[in-house]
């Protein structure tokens, strides 16, 4: 069973001091939400017993193995069902605690009832505050049964449940009609899946005979031991104030386990700690009684004395539960109550015995669960004991169960049963996950679900290039960490597989399924530099750059230009997807902005070194567009343009710029400056005859303004081919200014 204990502190004078603690003795318990250890969960279960809403309860984790619930503000907060969930995978287990109000109308004589399949369960609700109304019994919150108030027997209402079956398990309550549900008596009925002393799928297997009030688990045949007892059959008492499957936990506080209720995995349920009894576990056992809830009687013989925590303490020369065995009778010594081996291993098991006459090698034998008897291969004889060593044949799963070491001499015999757990080495069910990749390394998460048994002690990652026949490379990692595979080849597919191991000899599992992980491209190493740039408008910038000349092919897919606007804290990125490109036009920029500009080569997703940055100031946005632009052909080589000044000018115009382009032509347009801003007409000369031209213009103050509308006009025919257009304003002729 899972080593999980739910502790309830029942010192109820002040609900604010009440707390519930869930303690796990499991390896890796509560470590987090990964595959190796789901967290401990501790919560109030409001599905059956609903209490008025109050402030939320506080959950505090004390390390990975303990979680505590506090923050109860009033007694009604305590009433109901609490559960703790722990353990991983198929071993995930829920432990349940049912809390009754001490001031309820009805109180349970006993809260937890563990019964065998087919038994009759009797739930007894004691009248604490009488009401002359019927008593309603509910099962898991649903109406179940009615008793008239006249039916109380000795101040108790009894619910008899004959021939119970596992589905009858659950939370039962007895409530006076019309009374608050918080005044109910709440019970927990646990019905084992088998009849008394049996376990297993068809209830065909015999329980080990749990001692000291331990309960045989109907699924795995293990004894769930009461708090304060340990061993395969709960044969060993812990020291006072200790609990847990290996007595590894200590009760908090100076008064030990007084006032604590212990709840353990089903089918045990809840009880006081060893040596204590009563509804609040505050009463010490009466003389002659011991154990959880003081349910056990000592009946010590041969001068043994009764200890309320451990039972009979035997005088020298005697041993046994009741000090009934003489030390002359042979005795198995210090046999571990539980051993764990991995599947298909051939372990050695030792069994030591003492007695008078002294046991010899042939007098000690080992019996497997299927009845096979193994004889020891050698024995070590020491003055106080003989230790027989058994070589066990290759283990199979069917060897899991209770083995028995038996010693027989003329003085008598002794046997000790112990549990052997044959564990299946873990095998990953999925491939590892790729987290990040670079050109020469892969970062991999090996955490995958697995079949077989944990805990995971080591994780091996095997990898080699895809389609390679070379040996696998192996790296051993911590189970909870991601792995970096280094010194790989760029742009190469690798087959990667996980192998998990559990503790012990033969704990290595088979390799998991492979997955293909590909390293990234090599990083581009060349650093470009910015050749130059020029402003083509208030929001346009043409940039050119170069690369160093190196032998061999260029490693790169293109360029990334970055413009940083420090004032606004904004970055603009422009992707140039050709590695041959050496120029780019950046548009849509913000006029009047100071930019930092750089360029870098990229390859796949990797960026090379950035060029040294350049600082570029875009001119502020210019004036509005000139209005009513009009073109009029004057000859076969001249066209006159007229316009009106822009409206709402922010300042004096420094010049106009005219753009001239042959209609339908593929060449770049020509820009001509009109340096006399007061003019409203100009003549463009040197044009070709019978040719259709497009014109538009804009004004400049500090920066170039918006373009005007475009106008079309054709020169007159039959002229000679001109050398190219020039401009003449009304006042004077100007030379061509491109």
């Amino acid at each position: 069973a899972v080593d999980l204990t739910l502790l309830a502190n029942l010192r109820l004078t002040d609900p604010q001091r009440f707390f519930l603690t869930c303690v796990s003795g499991e390896a890796g318990a509560g470590r987090g939400s990964d595959a190796w250890g789901p967290p401990l969960l501790l919560e109030k279960d409001d599905r059956i017993v609903r209490t008025p809403p109050g402030p939320p309860l506080r959950l505090a984790r004390n390390g990975s193995h303990q979680v505590t619930l506090r923050g109860f503000s009033k007694p009604s907060d305590l009433v109901g069902v609490f559960s703790c969930v722990g353990g991983a995978g198929a071993r995930r287990t829920r432990v349940i605690y049912v809390h009754n109000s001490p001031g309820a109308h009805l109180l349970p004589d006993k809260v937890t009832h563990t019964v065998n399949k087919g038994d009759t369960a009797v739930l007894s609700a004691r009248v604490h505050k009488e009401k002359q109304t019927d008593v309603i019994w509910k099962s898991n919150g649903s109406y179940f049964y009615t008793l008239d108030w006249h039916e109380a027997q000795d101040g108790r209402f009894l619910l008899q449940l004959p021939n119970v079956q596992p589905p009858s398990s659950g939370i039962y309550s007895a409530t006076y009609l019309e009374a608050s549900p918080l005044g109910s008596a709440f019970f927990r009925l646990i019905v084992r899946g088998c009849g008394a002393g049996r376990w297993g799928p068809g209830c065909t297997k015999e329980c080990p005979g749990c001692l000291h009030g331990g309960v045989c688990h109907d699924h795995d045949g293990e004894c769930v031991c009461p708090p304060g007892f340990t061993g395969t059959r709960c044969e060993q008492a812990c020291r006072e104030g200790r609990f847990g499957q290996s007595c590894q936990e200590q009760c908090p506080g100076i008064s030990g386990c007084r006032g604590l209720t212990f709840c353990l995995p089903d089918p045990y349920g809840c009880s006081c700690g060893s040596g204590w009894r009563g509804s609040q576990c505050q009463e010490a056992c009466a003389p002659g009684h011991f154990g959880a809830d003081c349910r056990l009687q000592c009946q010590c013989q041969n001068g043994g004395t009764c200890d309320r925590f451990s039972g009979c303490v035997c005088p020298s020369g005697w041993h046994g539960v009741h000090c009934e065995k003489s030390d002359r009778i042979p005795q198995i010594l210090n046999m571990a109550s539980e051993l764990e081996f991995n599947l298909e291993t051939m372990p050695r098991i030792n069994c030591a015995a003492a007695g008078n006459p002294f046991p010899v090698r042939g007098s000690i034998e080992l019996r497997k669960p299927d009845g096979t008897v193994l004889l020891s291969t050698k024995a070590i004889v020491e003055p106080e004991k003989t230790t027989a060593e058994f070589e066990v044949p290759r283990l199979v799963l069917a060897d899991s169960g209770f083995w028995e070491c038996r010693v027989s001499t003329s003085g008598g015999q002794d046997s000790r049963r112990f549990k052997v757990n044959v564990k299946v080495p873990p095998v990953p069910l999925a491939a590892p996950r790729l987290l990040t990749k670079q050109s020469r390394q892969l970062v991999v998460s090996p955490l995958v679900s697995f079949s077989g048994d944990g805990p995971i002690s080591t994780v091996r990652l095997h990898y080699r290039p895809q389609d390679s026949t070379m040996d696998w490379s192996t790296i051993v990692v911590d189970p909870s960490e991601n792995v970096t595979l280094m010194n790989l080849r760029p742009k190469t597919g690798y087959s990667v597989r996980v192998q998990l191991s559990r503790p012990g000899e033969g704990g290595e599992g088979a390799w998991g399924p492979p997955t293909l992980m590909t390293t990234d491209c090599p990083e581009p190493l060349l650093q470009p530099w910015l050749e130059g740039w020029h402003v083509e408008g208030t929001d346009r910038l043409r940039v050119s750059w170069s690369l160093p000349l190196v032998p061999g092919p260029l490693v790169g897919d293109g360029f990334l230009l970055r413009l940083w606007d420090g004032t606004r804290g904004q970055e603009r990125r422009e992707n140039v997807s050709s590695p041959q490109a050496r120029t780019a036009l950046l548009t849509g920029l913000t006029p009047g902005t100071h930019y930092q500009l750089d360029v870098q080569l990229y390859h796949c997703t990797l960026l090379g070194p950035a060029s040294p940055p350049a600082h570029v100031l875009l001119p502020p946005s210019g004036p509005p567009a000139p209005r009513h632009l009009h073109a009029q052909a004057l000859s076969d080589s001249e066209i006159q343009l007229t316009w009106k000044h822009p409206e709402a000018l922010p300042g004096p115009i420094s010049k106009y710029v005219v753009e001239v382009q042959v209609a339908g032509g593929a060449g770049d347009p020509l820009w001509i400056d009109v340096d006399r801003p007061e003019e409203t007409s100009t003549i463009i000369r040197g044009l070709n005859a019978s040719t259709r031209y497009l014109f538009r213009m804009r004004a400049s103050i500090q920066g170039l303004g918006d373009w005007s509308n475009t106008v079309e006009e054709s020169t007159l025919g039959n002229g000679l081919q001109a050398e190219g257009p020039v401009q003449e304003s009304r006042a004077a002729e100007e030379g061509l200014d491109q």
Epitope: T133, T146, D148, L177, E178
Partner: antibody
Amino acid sequence: EVQLLESGGGLVQPGGSLRLSCAASGFTFSHYVMWWVRQAPGKGLEWVSGIYPSGWTVYADSVKGRFTISRDNSKNTLYLQMNSLRAEDTAVYYCAKDLGGTRAFDYWGQGTLVTVSS
Amino acid sequence: DIQMTQSPGTLSLSPGERATLSCRASQSVSSSYLAWYQQKPGQAPRLLIYGASSRATGIPDRFSGSGSGTDFTLTISRLEPEDFAVYYCQQRGNWPRTFGQGTKVEIK
């Protein structure tokens, strides 16, 4: 679906006896209080007797000592043994199932007529 | 014994009208223990209301119950043709379990 089916009614002479049965189905019979209610011709309803899951029984004063209610949980059947019958016992006898918590009779059989006459 | 008195004895109404039936107990009855039943000629009674105001399964919401102590009321907000029947109240608080004498709701 809950069903209650009464049987055993008929004509009987004063002083005679009859045993009524009520076969129940569609619910967990052993968990519920069961009742007998009667209705004399043209009159209102009169509660007769009840039996709790535990076997505890209750009777109206008018039938106490003459009628016995019982149940057989293994057969899901309710009984009413009527002895020393009188003319005023003439009625349709209904068996009824309790809603739970003895709050009301939520299902009724169709009734069986008992006539006591010489 | 607790006497349950219903009024009126007969209520003559038309379909669509509102019906208000009264039930008075000779001593205080817990509201958890007051139920109303409907009975049509030749049929077994049918549970309408329990706990004074809770509708039984399948009962239309035009039926409602109210009251506490000694005075309880059954209201049918809008009479349908199938609602014309005899209605009984019943107390479950004391032995014996007693019914009212019934109120007949007939078509006017």
